[in-house]
Structure formats: C-alpha cells, structure tokens
C-alpha cells in the first residue's frame, strides 16, 4: 500500500478579519494510526493550533467528525480570525508511539492571510492656533489594516492637496499595518468654515473609502482690524467714541478703554454679528464726559484676542474747542499710538 | 526688555550651507512670529519668511523656496534659519524680526548677521 | 506680489524742515503698512504702523497718514539725528514687502 500522504490542498487562503477561516487537511490512509495535529509555523518555535488527541481550542472546530474510525478528513476552522492569526498553518500527522507519539509526515501548508479593514483614520492639526497666509500641518493615522497595499489621500473643501508625505509602518512582513501622513495646508482669511479631510482606500472597503476631518475652525485664529470712530456729540459735554473691532475668530475677545493711558472699561465680546466666512465683527462705545477733563484726552481702544498681545487704537480729543465734526481713524490695527489730532 | 540675539558674522564657501540662530529675550516666544529679512546694497530688504513657534505655522516667499528653511526650539527660545546651497547672491546681512501673530509690523529687529559667501 | 514704490530714492533738507516721503501699493493694503527708520550700521527701527500709529518711544514730529494704495511719513521739524534711510512696508499679503528706501540728508 502507497505511504500516507498528508494534503494540504489550498497553498494560501485570505479571510477578513472578523470571519471563519477554512484550513483544509486530508489523508491519503488510515495507517499509521496517530493523532493529527495542526500548528502554525515550522521548526521548534512552531505554535500548536489545535491536537484531536487532547488539550481545549475553543476558537477551533474540526470540520468532520474526527471520532469515526475511517475519518481522513483534518479539516479545521478557526472562528473570529484577527491580523495575529496570520501565517503558514501545518497540518501534521503523528504516529501512535509510547511513551509519546512520533511526528510522520506534514502537509505543504497553507498561508493564512487576514484582510483587516484600516481604523478610522484620525486627523489632527497643530498645537497652537496659526493666522491665515501660514503654511500648517495636519497629520492623518490609520491603524490596523492588512494587506499592506494602501490609499491616502488629502482634501482641504473638496480640492486635492499635493503636499504631503505618507509612510506605511512596518516597512517588512506584518500581521497588521499603520499609515501615518503629514499634510501642509496654506490657511486663508475665509477658512474658519473650512474642512481637512484624510480620506484612505483599501481591499477591504469595497470601494467606500473611509474619511477623517479637521475642522479649520479649529486651528485659524484671524485677528481683528480695530477702527475707533467719534460719533457725533450726544450732548454738549459728552462725546461718543466707537470701536469697531471687525473680522476676527475665534470670539474669544476682550476690550479695554484707557483715556490718557488710565483703565476706564474692560468688557468681554458678548453680542457679536458674524459674518458671512465666519469671522465675527464687534462694537465697544465709550460716552467720555469732556467738562472732565481740563487737557486733550487721549482715548485708546485695547483688544486681547484669543490670548494673545493686546493690540490697540488710539483717538486724540481734543477738549480745548467744542467738536466740529465727525473725525475718522481707519487704521487697521497697531500696537501703538496715533497721535493726529481729530479736529 | 525684549531683545532679539543673533549668531555671529559668518564667512562660508559657495555651495556650502549656513544655519543662522536667533535667540529670544524678554517675551513668551511661543505668542509671536519670527520673521527673517535679507538686507543687500542692491535688493535692499526682502521679506524671507516667518514662523511661529507655537503653532509651527510658516510662511514663506516663493523666491527664497529651497534656499531658507525656518525652524524653532521651544525649549531653548531659539529661531533658526538654514541657508542651503550658498552663492555670492546670498551674501546679505540677515535679520530676525519680531510680530504679533497675525497681520502686524515688525516691532523689535535683531542687530543683524553678515554672511559672506566667498571661495 | 505687492510691489511698494517709494517715488524718491534721496531726499535733501534743512533742519527744521517739514518733509514727506510717499509710498504707493500696486494694490490696496488696507492700511496695513508700516513705517521703518534704518541707520547706517543698524537695523531698522519701527517708526509707524497702521498707517499712522506711532510706536512707543517714537517723536510726535514723525506722522504717517493715507490709505488704499497711498500712503505718506511726514517729518515736522528735521533734526540732525533723523539722518537714515526710511523704508516702508506692506503686511496685508505675504510675502511681505519693502519700499526701495528714502535715503534723507540735511543740505
């Protein structure tokens, strides 16, 4: 009679992470009588996977009934199959033998390989808020994913970046992959509404990749324009000083009045307006009582943004003469003075 | 006082490539920019670039890409400028600047350092 | 880019003189413009930003006005040590850019 021969039919087999995995074993004979036994790897570092003589597998089920004196079929199944599982499964039949059985002969193997979806990919931008015109990065990680093989790509509000650089960890064999990407991404003054989005591809998302974002809102800080404008009189002693504070994001603000460089309000943006690309506009009066004051009053409107230096306007009153008209000071915004006088 | 301490004069061969440093004194250098200017007789001053240490933000002018690159050490409060692949066109005093984040002027100015670029 | 056009290169005067030094924006800056005093042998000093904020430790006789695209430094009173080399600049758009420089003398 021909010696037995131990078939391992499939040379590889891929399941998805989560799935049952077929592992197909068949003898040729009965004889020698012996156990069959199924490990992963080869030579003495080799894991047991599953012995139909004795010890618990609970993940494994034999695919038919091994107790049947004719059986030679060594079929397995291993039940909720992760990255981990993969590798070169061997199906190897042992001789009766005392005190221990005798290795016989092995199958060929058959190579386990586990399609695992990649993990929700994770954006994040920088530490700090930056200001439009920067050029800020935003990494994008995805866990988990095998096989090797890949897809990331970057948008910023639908468009395509092309600045960034990628890189799929390990380099060599694994069980399970990461991909980590870094991505420049130049901020605009209209960007607080604006979206990042990382968005990966893989065999195992059927053509439905998965996607990440980062809000912009987020990461751009847009620093107020100050105006301070005098109104026209209100009264025949007092005068009406606005400052505009225009533009700004987030709304995180904080507005001090100092006249002749002495604090005479503090006030927190309440009731700002938004507009229309998100940033917000806010407006601070000041009512200065003129009879106050015997010399020029220096007004200065002095704005903390989002915890940042103070920035500040001033308006030069003069008090000598009664206004005449409505004075105007359109400079954008300063860390010092303006020293004009208005009228 | 707010001071802005920059490496000393250097004199390089052409090809060569130079990192400038730029130390900050006196203020929290992670809430401004650092800005970076070039001064030549013939150019006169030219806008290279800026970063912002706490957000890592950099903007650049397109005419000094692949010639300056712009780095920050938080730890040390330290700007630095690389000048790679030098040629007498990059002799230039450089200077480092301070600005609030955002759109505003340039309010403290380092005392300058003179590269040479000279075989 | 913005290009900042400062019509003279050299400009001569006598103490006490008032004088202005013009700087026009190929495009509108919105006021984002600053001011810079440079001496020979240093560096340049920040005078006004905003147009026409003075900064701290700046002389009321130096004063900046305009907007759009134009924009002027005006010096009441020449004195002696406000011989340098002035030079204005844009920080609406990046990259940033400098004026080509007013070399002022006293006659």
């Known amino acids: 009679e021909e010696e037995l021969q131990v078939i391992q039919p499939d040379k590889s087999v891929l399941v998805a992470a989560g799935e049952t995995a077929t592992l197909r074993c068949t003898a040729t004979s009965l004889i020698p009588v012996g156990p069959i036994q199924w490990f992963r790897g080869a030579g003495p570092g080799r894991e047991l996977i599953y012995n139909q003589k004795e010890g618990h597998f609970p993940r494994v089920t034999t695919v038919s009934d091994l107790t049947k004196r004719n059986n030679m079929d060594f079929s397995i199944r291993i039940g909720n199959i992760t990255p981990a599982d993969a590798g070169t499964y061997y199906c190897v039949k042992f001789r009766k033998g005392s005190p221990d059985d005798v290795e016989f002969k092995s199958g060929a193997g058959t190579e386990l390989s586990v399609r695992a979806k990649p993990s929700a990919p994770v954006v994040s931008g920088p530490a700090a808020r930056a200001t439009p015109q920067h050029t800020v990065s935003f990494t994008c990680e995805s866990h988990g994913f095998s096989p090797r093989d890949i897809t990331l790509k970057w948008f910023k509000n639908g468009n395509e970046l092309s600045d960034f650089q990628t890189n799929v960890d390990p380099v060599g064999e694994s069980v399970s992959y990461s991909i980590h990407s870094t991505a420049k991404v130049v901020l605009t003054r209209e960007d607080v509404h604006s979206q990042v989005i990382c968005e990966v591809a893989h065999v195992t998302l059927q053509g439905d990749p998965l996607r990440g974002t980062a809000n912009l809102s987020e990461t751009i800080r847009v620093p107020p324009t100050l105006e301070v404008t005098q109104q026209p009189v209100r009264a025949e002693n007092q005068v009406n000083v606005t400052c505009q504070v225009r533009k700004f994001y987030p709304q995180r603000l904080q507005l001090t009045w100092l006249e002749n460089g002495n604090v005479s309000r503090t006030e927190t943006a309440s009731t700002v307006t938004e507009n229309k690309d998100g940033t917000y506009n806010w407006m601070s009066w000041l009512l200065v009582n003129v009879s106050a004051h015997r010399d020029d009053v220096k007004l200065t409107c002095q704005v903390e943004h989002d915890g940042q230096p103070a920035v500040s306007k001033s308006h030069d009153l003069k008090v000598s003469a009664h206004p005449k008209e409505q004075g105007s000071n359109t400079a954008a915004e300063n860390t010092g003075s303006n020293e004009r006088n208005i009228y | 006082e707010v001071q802005l301490q920059e490496s000393g004069a250097e004199l390089v061969r052409p090809g060569a490539s130079v990192k400038l440093s730029c130390k900050a004194l006196g203020y929290t250098f992670t809430d401004y920019e650092i800005h970076w200017v070039k001064e030549t007789p013939v150019y006169g001053l030219e806008w290279i670039g800026d970063i912002h240490p706490g957000s890592g933000g950099t903007a650049n002018n397109q005419k000094f890409k692949g010639k300056a690159t712009l780095t920050a050490d938080k730890s040390s409060n330290t700007a630095y400028m690389e000048l790679s692949s030098l040629t007498s066109e990059d002799s230039a005093v450089y200077y480092c600047?301070?600005?609030?984040?955002?759109?505003?002027?340039?309010?403290?100015w380092g005392q300058g350092t003179s590269v040479t670029v000279s075989s | 880019d913005i290009q900042m056009t400062q019509s003279s290169s050299s400009f001569s005067g006598s103490l006490g003189d008032r004088l202005t030094i013009n700087c026009k924006a190929s495009e509108d800056i919105y006021d984002r413009v600053a001011w810079y005093q440079q001496k020979p042998g240093n560096a340049p000093r920040l005078l006004i930003s905003?147009?026409?904020s003075l900064e701290t430790g700046v002389l009321s006789r130096f004063s900046g006005s305009g907007s759009g695209k134009d924009y002027t430094l005006s010096i009441n009173g020449l004195q002696a040590e406000d011989v340098a080399t002035y030079y204005c600049?844009?920080?609406?758009?990046?990259?940033?850019?400098f004026g080509g420089g007013t070399k002022l003398e006293i006659k």
């Open positions: 905003g147009t026409a």
């Open positions: 600047t301070r600005a609030v984040s955002g759109y505003y002027a340039m309010d403290y």
């Open positions: 600049q844009q920080y609406w758009t990046t990259p940033w850019t």
